[in-house]
């Protein structure tokens, strides 16, 4: 029958070549000579000449070793023709299957594989995967079946087998407890890939396992006890730098220190921050210290990390003994700003008040007083007692020096220390009013018509305060009341002047006497211009009208 089963040819055959594979035979050769030929890739098309056929005998010949990794199967066609060239059979399919030999070693996809795992992880945790390929047949044979193994581990600490590898997937897992980055930050594994499912050819690669840091080390103080000396009263003064060591990765959150004052700072005098470069705790004063109140502070400082501890760890504590150094402190006025009342116009030499300072220092020092700011030169101070007396006439109404009834004075107290120090006190003199000003009308010129005149209203002011001010009373004197009338408004702060009788156009002087509620009288001359006009007039008398 004109059929042929598949021909299995092992790759890498040693020959001799040409090698007879199989014989084609047509049963139609009884009365005629048959010629055989083959076509297809490997015969008459690329790769040409791998296979040929003996034209007359029909033997299929192989001319060279085959390579399964290049071509797994050749599909050829066998032809049978008679002497005259006529086809005597249909083209016959010839399948030549190249069978595998273990002629390829496994190859890792990388020379070096890199992976990482957190220190202290559970045995069983997977780390990374390595991959090798083998060009041989892994379906019908074990030639291409790769088995992975770990050949060696460096360093061999704490055990020589810290990792294992899945035989068929190449997944590397932790097998032992004790991964500690601070002891071994990196492992180098020589991994093997062996074909024949572990029984054949071997190739190696390197797997580098980086051990990642966990915050499994607490920062520790080095040293644990500190002593510092700080001048009193200084704010922001650097008291001490506290140094810590931490075995975790430098400049990582597991290494960066966070400091807390956990005891000894009841008055909230101190603060501690982390120095960004050195990781030291910088202890500074938040408030000034007071030698006289407390000459020593014992602080307890705790240190943790920016990152939370990965495991339960003891927290380190340092002790800082802060000695407060005494400095010559300035005397302090009590109160620093003193408000007192003084009557304006008191006699020179009269006592205004006593304003004294206290020296915070323990040793008795002599305090002397001076006035540093007294813009009107109204006051004097006794250098020994701090008694303040009038040296000029205090005037509440002096707007240059007195604002809102208050006259501000600065007093200095200087101690006898070496060097001496000076404290400042502010004396706020609230000046009480006396009736030292009379009422004044405004304006002091009026213009009025001599026919049906409109009364002219003047405003009355008095620099004094109530009750030495409004309501006011008005009176015309020196016979001014013959032609004129003065009438104070109901509110008592304006006066209306009006003509009682006809006056010819001219300028007249009126004597207006105004008295305040405290009966202080003030005489003011009012210049009145009378015009020939009716009703109201403004600015000037109207010019007489001349007919044409």
């Amino acid at each position: 029958e004109w059929v042929m089963p598949p021909i299995f040819v092992p790759e890498n055959g040693k020959g001799p070549f040409p090698q007879r594979l199989n014989q084609l035979k047509s049963n139609k050769d009884r009365g005629t000579k048959i010629f055989y030929s083959i076509t297809g890739p490997g015969a008459d098309s690329p790769p040409e000449g791998v296979f040929t056929i003996e034209k007359e005998s029909g033997w299929l010949l192989l001319h060279m070793p085959l390579d399964r990794e290049k071509i797994v199967k050749y599909e050829l066609y066998g032809h049978a023709v008679s002497e005259n060239g006529a086809s005597v059979e249909e083209p016959m399919n010839i399948s030549i299957i190249v069978t595998d030999q273990n002629d390829n070693k496994p190859k890792f996809t990388q020379d070096t594989f890199r992976g990482s795992v957190l220190e202290g992880v559970m045995p069983g945790t997977s780390v990374m995967q390595v991959t090798a390929t083998d060009e041989d047949d892994a379906v019908n044979t074990y030639n291409g079946v790769v088995a992975y193994s770990i050949h060696s581990q460096e360093p061999k600490e704490p055990h020589d087998l810290m990792f294992t590898i899945h035989k068929s997937t190449g997944t590397i897992s932790v097998i032992s407890s004790g991964l500690d980055r601070e002891k071994v930050p990196e492992y180098r594994l020589t991994v093997q890939a062996t074909d024949m499912d572990g029984e054949g050819s071997t190739t190696t690669a390197e797997a580098v396992v980086q051990i990642l840091d966990a915050n499994d080390n607490a920062p520790e103080f080095e040293p644990q006890k500190y002593e510092a000396w700080v001048p009193e009263n200084e704010v922001g003064h650097e008291v001490q730098r506290l140094t810590v060591t931490d075995l975790d990765v430098p400049n990582s959150p597991a290494w960066r220190a966070t400091y807390h004052i956990v005891g000894g700072d009841d008055g909230d005098h101190f603060t501690i921050t982390t120095h960004p470069e050195t990781n030291q705790g910088v202890l500074t004063t938040k408030k000034g210290l007071d030698f006289e109140a407390q000459d020593q502070h014992t602080l307890y400082v705790e240190v943790t990390n920016e990152a939370p501890f990965a495991v339960k760890l003891p927290t380190a504590t340092a002790t800082v003994v802060v000695h407060v150094k005494d400095v010559n402190e300035a005397p302090v006025f009590v109160p620093p700003s003193k408000v007192i009342e003084a009557q304006e116009g008191i006699s020179i030499g009269e006592l205004v008040c006593i304003y004294t300072a206290q020296d915070p220092d323990k040793e008795d020092q002599k305090i002397s007083y001076t006035i540093s700011r007294d813009p009107a030169n109204w006051l004097a101070v006794d250098p020994d007692s701090g008694q303040i007396t009038a040296a000029g006439i205090l005037d509440r109404e002096d707007e240059q020096f007195v604002k809102n009834n208050v006259y501000e004075v600065m007093v200095l107290a200087t101690d006898s220390g070496n060097p001496p120090t000076t404290g400042t006190g502010t004396l706020l003199l609230t000046l009480t009013d006396i009736n030292d000003h009379g009422p004044i009308p405004e304006p002091r010129q009026i213009i009025i018509c001599n026919q049906s005149p409109v009364p002219q209203v003047l405003n009355i002011t008095d620099k004094d305060l109530s009750p030495n001010s409004s309501p006011f009373q008005a009176q015309l004197t020196h016979d001014s009341d013959i032609y004129w009338m003065a009438e104070v408004s109901e509110k008592g702060d304006t006066v209306a002047l009006s003509l009682k009788k006809f006056l010819k156009q001219d300028t007249y002087d009126l004597h207006l006497s105004l008295s305040d509620h405290g009966n202080r009288e003030q005489l003011t001359m009012i210049r009145a211009t009378v015009c020939d006009c009716h009703g109201q007039v403004f600015n000037d008398c109207p010019r007489p009208w001349k007919g044409g």
């Epitope: 202290g120 992880v121 899945h166 068929s168 097998i175 407890s177």
Partner: antibody, heavy 117, light 111 residues
Framework: EVQLLESGGGLVQPGGSLRLSCAAS????????MSWVRQAPGKGLEWVSA????????YYADSVKGRFTISRDNSKNTLYLQMNSLRAEDTAVYYC??????????WGQGKMVTVSS | QSALTQPASVSGSPGQSITISCTGT?????????VSWYQQHPGKAPKLILS???KRPSGVSNRFSGSKSGNTASLSISGLQAEDEADYYC???????????FGGGTKLTVL
Amino acid sequence: EVQLLESGGGLVQPGGSLRLSCAASGFTFSSYAMSWVRQAPGKGLEWVSAISGSGGSTYYADSVKGRFTISRDNSKNTLYLQMNSLRAEDTAVYYCASWGDGTLNPWGQGKMVTVSS
Amino acid sequence: QSALTQPASVSGSPGQSITISCTGTSNDVGAYNYVSWYQQHPGKAPKLILSEVNKRPSGVSNRFSGSKSGNTASLSISGLQAEDEADYYCSSFTSGLPWVVFGGGTKLTVL
């Protein structure tokens, strides 16, 4: 001598709670992962829970997840298993064991936990 | 049902040899050389007798040996003694949680 010693077993009603302790000695306790394994009467061994050496990672069998809590105090060299919402099927001898190198070794002597009304 | 398969029981006479098999998969026994065997006497805790397929902890008799082929591991006991009568459990390291799988146990009877 490496030793693990359990305590705290006993009889408890369904829905009740119990805490097992396992005191370790003879090895650096904090360096080793630990496991709890149980064995129901007449049955085989069943893995229950595990914890890393630091105590930072914990793992549970599906059958106990959400009801049991594994913990450790490395300063006291002690492993714990807090068992809540106990069921009849939790009745077993509970063993603590060190886990590493692909094996469980050593084992504690075991503590019987009986869940019954 | 246990992840690893063991015969429920085996028996042998004193002086004889026996073998207990433990069959797993390509993800446990077949994948790793981390097969352990434990001996458990009635009322006692399991005791490790072999680790990493064939490593004996100190104090364990050399009559106990282990081997592995493919997905199956075996425990062999030679020169059976009366005190060998116990339950024997195999375990294997495995990929992923719970990282350890047990066999159902084999009861060894010394006749």
